[in-house]
């Protein structure tokens, strides 16, 4: 189910996945919800910690039994993440932080008015994931009402200093807020250039683009199709940038499909999840569960129940079947995607629905526990 | 909303505006979305107008202005009024909407979490009053959506400037000491929302208060968390299934 | 139903005194402010004074304040109007009216309902 | 204080007729202007709040519209009931209501 609940000065020991700089709890348990093996967080704020490398930590989690130790530390906060927790689901996130510096690759500086101002430019460039802002106070005549255009690798901060007289925040691109628009064409047999940010296995262009759109540094993408010539290359999904924004070039292909991130369209961003089902295919991946469930849709909402479970597939092979029930394979991987894709196979596949927004929990009580 | 700002898009997604047409239309109330086919609003809302079939519900909008004939709009499928509230009483102040058809949510048009019953443990610091209503007593409506940061008021604090009226237990105050932000004319059923541990939650429904931002009155509003029973009793489909589950 | 009432009007002498009452049901009276206003005799509407949901602030016309004052008891659902040191052009028809609540929908600043009035003589 | 002048003072209309009444504020009154409907012998009724609502239960054909100083009433087809006086009332400052319109039969 949906655990919303934080423990202050509390830490999970064990079970890091990942760990980043985030300026908020928030903006951590976000982070925690959109990567494909964190259940769980622990965020370190500034006040919390000595060691200046650790302040603003943000450690990711997992564990099979979908829990951790927690041991007290003064000023922590832990949680969960929000995988499941329907309609709270989302990477927008508007906050501005202030007196907090959120270092990364500077590409871009202007003189503007207003934090505000800072933030909207921000959206509205297809580079910047992150900005600061020194504010008309700052103790630098020369870097007053500047505006830091930032990125990243990993789409989060290098680095987060306490600074006085600096704001900071994200792009609101996630929100559905940037002017820049969006190319929903897919542009069939066609590969792009440019460089390669990942690499994954999905089932279709379709599935590729919405990862592509919730990948910190994917601007466009190209996919191989499952009959591509090179078998080694076959479902692979490309996410790529370039420095333009733009692919610099693209060359017609046979079997490929290429588009763009759908992050900087207007008023509307795909879910971040995947409903369809894929007759005839088997998503291969780390065991999970096998249970005998009646139906593919059962097996969906099997996979969707159980947090940790990515992907799944549903065996119609006789030996999986016992009267109306059949095998479903319950199945995770690091990225969160397929480690194998096969054809022709007696069954069908798909992916959970975790991070689908429709849930129609209201009832989204927060219980703060302190220790 | 009296000593508010402009609202941007997306910022309070689960704000909708409850619309009358009769000749023309017009903004009467706002109102929560709480689920898919579910907003929350106030009672007084429907006195002497309770016909389904003249209110027109819009979601996902930030400037009424932009409404043609051509905007969607969600139909009223049933209006369900608290039991006990009565128009020749001030309490319990409550009313549900179901819709004719179920709204998909995006950021621009989703629900805002409700409360654990009966709530009072949870203090909340930062909370915010949403509405197009006027902003100052002799106002108009207003195009785009105010937002105003309110700061709650103790019940007993609210009752010693209301000796007129009961405060009950079912209801919550906000307001400045010396006035000057408020909810107004128009913003009746929008939402009081608090930020608690990053997520937001529907604490109050606006409701009423004397005059609009004056000094030492503040906006009485109907309390969310004291309804719980009741929303999630209403709320529950024919098949018995809840509309809105409670996370475990 | 939504309903006032009114009462205490009759012939008074120039000088006197009567106080109006004026009951109202079906509907919050204490959220409500209330209105007298008065007609005479081949004349129009004329406001006479207001008051507000909790009684904190009256406001009265020009031409009866010093004289007259209103008043309300919310226990009672009543409203009145004191009228001292009448006159000739007191004379009239005085109805009790609602006009907007302190509810915060967008249903304001008309007198909604009005009662049927009580007529109001000065005459020696 | 705001003054408010109405007119005609009186008109003469047969039923089907259009109607217009005007009234004018002293001072603008945004749009602050309420309608009534009073017969004799009864309570005034409440037909149009802030310029141009049509209070609940009031038939279409009666309108407001304006804004500050200038208002209208309009009938658009005048029906057997609507012999009356109108009167209208602004509400922008304390209270003042127009001299009123009697609309007879012809």
């Known amino acids: 189910g949906c655990l919303t609940q934080l423990y202050e000065n509390a830490f999970f020991r064990g079970g890091d996945v990942a760990s980043m700089y985030t300026p908020n709890a928030q903006y951590c348990q976000m982070r925690c919800t959109f990567h494909p093996r964190c259940l769980l967080f622990s965020f370190l704020p500034a006040s919390s910690i000595n060691d200046m490398e650790k302040r603003f930590g943000c450690f990711l989690k997992d564990s099979v039994t979908g829990t951790l130790p927690k041991v007290h530390r003064t000023g922590a906060v832990s949680g969960h993440s929000l995988k499941q927790c329907g309609h709270q689901i989302s990477a927008c996130h508007r906050d501005i932080y202030k007196g907090v510096d959120m270092r990364g690759v500077n590409f871009n500086v202007s003189k503007v008015s207003s934090v505000e101002e800072c933030q909207k430019r921000c959206t509205s460039n297809i580079r910047c994931q992150f900005f600061s802002y020194a504010t008309q106070t700052f103790h630098k005549a020369e870097y007053r009402n500047n505006c830091l255009l930032k990125y990243s690798p990993g789409g989060t901060p290098t680095a987060i200093k306490v600074l006085s007289n600096v704001e900071s925040g994200f792009s609101l691109k996630p929100c559905a807020l940037s002017e820049i628009g969006c190319h929903m064409n897919i542009f069939q047999h066609l590969a792009f250039s440019d460089v390669d940010v990942a690499r994954v296995l999905t089932p279709d262009a379709f599935v590729c683009r919405t990862i592509c759109t919730y990948h910190p540094n994917c601007l466009f993408f190209t996919f191989y199709t499952n009959v591509w010539k090179i078998e080694s290359q076959r479902n692979v999904c490309l996410l790529k940038t370039s420095e333009s924004g733009t692919p610099s070039s693209s060359t017609p292909q046979e079997n490929t499909i290429s588009g763009y991130s759908l992050l900087t369209c207007k008023r509307t961003l795909p879910e971040p999840c995947h409903s369809k089902i894929y007759p005839g295919v088997d998503f291969g991946g780390e065991e999970l569960n096998v249970t005998f469930v009646k139906g593919v849709n059962v097996c969906q909402e099997t996979c969707t129940k159980m947090i940790r479970c990515q992907f799944f597939t549903y065996s119609l092979l006789p030996e999986d079947c016992k009267e109306e029930k059949c095998k479903c394979f319950l199945r995770l991987s690091m990225d969160g995607s397929p480690t194998r894709i096969a054809y022709g196979t007696q069954g069908s596949s798909g992916y959970s629905l975790r991070l689908c927004n429709t849930g129609d929990n209201s009832v989204c009580t927060t219980k703060t526990s302190t220790r | 909303i009296v000593g508010g700002t402009n609202s941007s898009w997306g910022e309070w997604p689960w704000q909708v505006s409850l619309q009358v047409k009769l000749t023309a239309q017009r903004h009467l109330c706002g109102g929560s979305l709480i689920g898919h086919q579910w907003v929350l609003t106030a009672a007084h809302c429907f006195d002497g107008l309770p016909l389904q079939d003249v209110w027109r519900i819009y979601s996902g909008i930030l400037n009424l202005s932009d409404i043609t004939k051509d905007t969607p709009f969600s139909q009223i499928k049933e209006i369900i009024i608290h039991q006990n509230y009565k128009v020749s009483e001030g309490n319990h102040d409550i009313a549900l909407i179901k819709l004719q058809a179920p709204l998909n949510y995006t950021e621009f048009q989703k629900p805002i979490c409700l409360p654990s019953k009966g709530d009072t443990s949870t203090i909340y610091t930062n909370c915010w009053v949403t509405g197009w209503g006027f902003s100052k007593e002799k106002g108009e409506i207003q195009n785009i959506l105010q937002k105003v940061n309110i700061p709650l008021v103790t019940n007993e604090e609210c009752q010693k400037r209301y000796q007129d009226y009961k405060i009950t237990q079912r209801m919550v105050c906000a307001g400045y000491k010396e006035g000057g932000k408020d909810a107004c004319k128009g913003d009746s059923g929008g939402p009081l929302v608090c930020k608690h541990n990053g997520m937001w939650r529907l604490v109050g429904i606006t409701s009423w208060g004397e005059g609009c931002a004056r000094r030492e009155q503040p906006g009485v509003y109907t309390k969310v968390a004291e309804y719980m029973d009741w929303i999630l009793e209403k709320t529950q489909s024919s098949d018995g299934k809840a509309q809105m589950q409670s996370p475990a | 139903e939504v309903q006032l009432l009114e009462s205490g009007g009759g012939l008074v002498q120039p000088g006197g005194s009567l106080r109006l009452s004026c009951a109202a049901s079906g509907f919050t009276f204490s959220f409500y402010n209330m209105n007298w206003v008065r007609q005479a005799p081949g004349k129009s509407l004329e406001w006479v004074s207001s008051?507000?949901?909790?009684?904190?602030?009256?406001n009265y016309a020009d031409s009866v304040k010093g004289r007259f004052t209103i008043s309300r008891d919310n226990s009672k659902n009543t409203l009145y109007l004191q009228m001292n040191s009448l006159r000739a052009e007191d004379t009239a028809v005085y109805y009790c009216?609602?006009?907007?609540?302190?509810?915060?929908?967008?249903?304001?600043?008309?007198?909604?309902?009005w009662g049927l009035g009580t007529m109001v003589t000065v005459s020696s | 204080d705001i003054q408010m002048t109405q007119s005609p003072s009186s008109l003469s209309a047969s039923v089907g007729d259009r109607v217009t009444i005007t009234c004018r504020a002293s001072q603008s009154i945004s749009v602050y202007l309420n309608w009534y409907q009073h017969k004799p012998g009864k309570a005034p009724k409440l037909l149009i709040y802030?310029?141009?609502n049509l209070q609940f239960g009031v038939p279409s054909r009666f309108s407001g519209s304006g804004y500050g100083t200038d208002f209208t009433l309009t009938i658009s087809s005048l029906q057997p009931e609507d012999f009356a006086t109108y009167h209208c009332q602004q509400t922008f400052s304390l209270f003042t209501f127009g001299g009123g319109t009697k609309v007879e039969i012809k």
């Open positions: 008051i507000s949901p909790s009684g904190g602030e009256t």
């Open positions: 009216a609602r006009g907007g609540g302190a509810y915060r929908n967008n249903w304001w600043g008309g007198f909604d309902i």
């Open positions: 802030g310029a141009s």
